[in-house]
């Protein structure tokens, strides 16, 4: 058993049919010695008396808020949560496996630049009685500070018969140098509590590996005289690290017909303009990627040819 | 990444082309190592990230762009005088360049070159003949060092009398390639910045 926060405790349980329970001794936080009784949750029934209560925690029916009282007055609370371990593996019932980029990916993180700011998100089908708390650091043995905000519900989607909820959190490394070469990864730890179930999820990454620039901005077409060609121009996204001559991007320009089956023409360039042939009803899209370190491409920025 | 990239004009900052070749070569070599050594811990997640130049050179700090000198987190061990020698700087105003930048890059290349050559000598003794260093990568390191044109003492190649542990050597190769790729990215950024100045 360990303390998650004040008056909230996590009991770690091996979860198999003939597993023994965990013996837990609860102590009432009071100088009083006599006349103390214990109750659980909303029930007014007395579970035991005395300054300590020894319980066997085996089921979610044994978890909950234990309260000690004296003469009708509440003295203290202890909320017990359960953390299940099945076949030596901690349970992952609360979050959905996003399976990208690999199986058992519960947390996904992205950064728009090298400033040390990043966003992580996760998915669940649970809609109520759910809380998250996020901690992060650079390295684990001698951790350096990363500050994370509160996790918030960022999207709701219908997936077949189920509703899916996306939560996200923004974190900022306390003293980040955009030009630094990372040797210690960022560690992100998410505590998830659903009703009386506790689970924790972790992700470890280098900012350089989770970079995904915003799409190029101000995408414009300039027709070239007496030609089907157009000059496409764009700019670096505002959120990209500066100076741009140091943090350079490379671009992919794509001409896509109305039909998905039509052949796509693609050009790669380090410049912020390109000359392409604009077909009728086609659209021109541009996306960006770090020029020197191949992490993710940005989403496409698009304009119609017409 | 096999993308069409224009060859730089001869008038360009001379080292940019070499640094781009370096990054391409080390990335290809790392990819080859990851594929060949698929049963070894050779991915970014599996290896320990060691920097053989740590405490010996200060490339990141010395080559910091002017715009980032206002960022206190970037100013750990920065020098502030400016570089004046080295042929890469020919006909370029280099007021943004901090002391030791290009010489620091040169020292990095020299250290990695020695490590890679020593390692290659060991790998050539491996009866499995599983992996060797790409000669192209070693040649590109050499070319960039020549372009930087710093006069520096030659470092003798390390020689070892004991029988090499090939498993450890291959893991060390992965660690070295990952670190060198990261340094090659920094070098490319610096050269690109220099070129634009």
């Amino acid at each position: 058993i360990w303390e998650l926060k004040k008056d909230v405790y996590v009991v770690e349980l091996d979860w198999y049919p003939d597993a023994p329970g965990e013996m837990v001794v609860l102590t009432c936080d009071t100088p009083e010695e006599d006349g103390i009784t214990w109750t659980l949750d909303q029930s007014s029934e007395v579970l035991g008396s005395g300054k300590t209560l020894t319980i066997q925690v085996k089921e979610f029916g044994d978890a909950g808020q234990y309260t000690c009282h004296k003469g009708g007055e509440v003295l203290s609370h202890s909320l017990l949560l359960l953390h299940k371990k099945e076949d030596g593996i901690w349970s992952t019932d609360i979050l959905k496996d996003q399976k990208e980029p690999k199986n058992k990916t519960f947390l996904r993180c992205e950064a728009k630049n090298y400033s040390g700011r990043f966003t992580c998100w996760w998915l669940t089908t649970i809609s109520t009685d759910l809380t998250f708390s996020v901690k992060s650091s650079r390295g684990s043995s001698d951790p350096q500070g990363v500050t994370c905000g509160a996790a918030t519900l960022s999207a709701e989607r219908v997936r077949g018969d189920n509703k899916e909820y996306e939560y996200s959190v923004e974190c900022q490394e306390d003293s980040a140098c955009p030009a630094a070469e990372e040797s210690l990864p960022i560690e992100v730890m998410v505590d998830a509590v659903h009703k009386l179930k506790y689970e924790n999820y972790t992700s470890s990454f280098f900012i350089r590996d989770i970079i995904k620039p915003d799409p190029p901005k101000n995408l414009q077409l300039k027709p070239l005289k007496n030609s089907r060609q157009v000059e496409v121009s764009w700019e670096y996204p505002d959120t990209w690290s500066t100076p741009h001559s140091y943090f350079s991007l490379t671009f992919c320009v794509q001409v896509q017909g109305k039909s998905k089956r039509e052949k796509k023409d693609r050009v790669f360039t380090d410049k912020t303009s390109a000359t392409v042939i604009c077909r009728k009803n086609a659209s021109i899209s541009v996306r960006a990627q770090d020029r020197y370190y191949s992490s993710s491409w940005s989403e496409w920025a698009s304009v119609p040819c017409s | 990444r096999n993308l069409p990239v224009a060859t730089p004009d001869p008038g360009m900052f001379p080292c940019l082309h070499h640094s781009q070749n370096l990054l391409r070569a080390v990335s290809n070599m790392l990819q080859k190592a990851r594929q060949t050594l698929e049963f070894y811990p050779c991915t970014s997640e599996e290896i320990d990230h060691e920097d053989i130049t740590k405490d010996k050179t200060s490339t990141v700090e010395a080559c910091l762009p002017l715009e980032l000198t206002k960022n206190e987190s970037c100013l750990n061990s920065r020098e502030t005088s400016f570089i004046t020698n080295g042929s890469c700087l020919a006909s370029r105003k280099t007021s943004f360049m901090m002391a030791l930048c290009l010489s620091s890059i040169y020292e990095d290349l020299k250290m990695y070159q020695v490590e890679f050559k020593t390692m290659n000598a060991k790998l050539l003794m491996d009866p499995k003949r599983q992996i060797f260093l790409d000669q192209n990568m070693l040649a590109v390191i050499d070319e960039l060092m020549q372009a930087l044109n710093f006069n520096s003492e030659t470092v003798p190649q390390k020689s070892s009398l004991e029988e090499p542990d090939f498993y450890k050597t291959k893991i060390k190769l992965c660690i070295l390639l990952h670190a060198f790729r990261i340094r090659a990215v920094t070098i490319d950024r610096v050269m690109s910045y220099l070129n634009a100045s």
Epitope: D18, L40, D41, S43, I55, F60, G61 | -
Partner: antibody, heavy 119, light 107 residues
């Protein structure tokens, strides 16, 4: 006052289905799991299993798994034990009981439902 | 499954007698043991839990002791209403199991 009131005695033929009930009152139904115990004529007590009234989480005795089904209706504070195809060997007294949290034993018992299966 | 063995299977005693019933577990169950009393035609009633804690409302003449594998239920001075069958139950490891019962009769 804590009370567990069980449905009346049943006489059934082999192969028939049956669902017996246990209605709870006098306490917070969702705080306490409900269990079932079998007592064959002239025999001792056998633990069938327990169930959470909150989310229908169930622990069956392997000996009874597949033979009986436990269920619960939170809105009426009622637990159920059912058979899809009765056998003569299911003839017994069935007790529902309230599981004590933080312990696991049964602190309050229903009066029992006698199930007789005979052709 | 854990086997619970009670002894004796039955015993005769008189009002005012001190009676001891024992229960042996086939493996260590800590203190997670309960005792129940059942009268003919009635549901069992909880007497003792955690090997030695009395259920509220149970007279003080009933006491439990033991831990691990050996447990006892003691009735210090038999009363006429105590003649019944007594069961022990371990609730440490699933499936929870009962002893075969000890029938206490009037001598």
């Amino acid at each position: 006052e804590v009370q567990l009131v069980q449905s009346g005695a049943e006489v059934k033929k082999p192969g028939e289905s049956l669902k017996i009930s246990c209605q709870s009152s006098g306490y917070s139904f969702t705080t306490y799991w409900i269990g079932w115990v079998r007592q064959m004529p002239g025999q001792g007590l056998e633990w069938i299993g327990i169930m959470s009234p909150v989310d229908s989480d169930i622990r069956y005795n392997p000996m009874f798994r597949g033979q009986v089904t436990m269920s619960v209706d939170k809105s009426s504070s009622t637990a159920y034990l059912q058979w899809s195809s009765l056998k003569a060997s299911d003839t017994a007294m069935y007790y529902c009981a309230r599981r004590r949290p933080g312990q696991g034993y049964f602190d309050f018992w229903g009066q029992g439902t006698m199930v007789t299966v005979s052709s | 499954d854990i086997q619970m063995t009670q002894s004796p299977s039955s015993l005769s005693a008189s009002v005012g007698d001190r009676v001891t019933i024992t229960c042996k577990a086939s493996q260590n169950v800590g203190s997670w043991l309960a005792w129940y009393q059942q009268k003919p035609g009635k549901a069992p009633k909880s007497l003792i839990y955690s090997a030695s804690s009395r259920q509220s409302g149970v007279p003080s003449r009933f006491s439990g002791s033991g831990s691990g594998t050996d447990f006892t239920l003691t009735i210090s001075s038999l009363q006429p209403e105590d003649f019944a069958t007594y069961y022990c139950q371990q609730y440490d490891i699933y499936p929870f199991t009962f002893g075969q019962g000890t029938k206490l009769e009037i001598k």
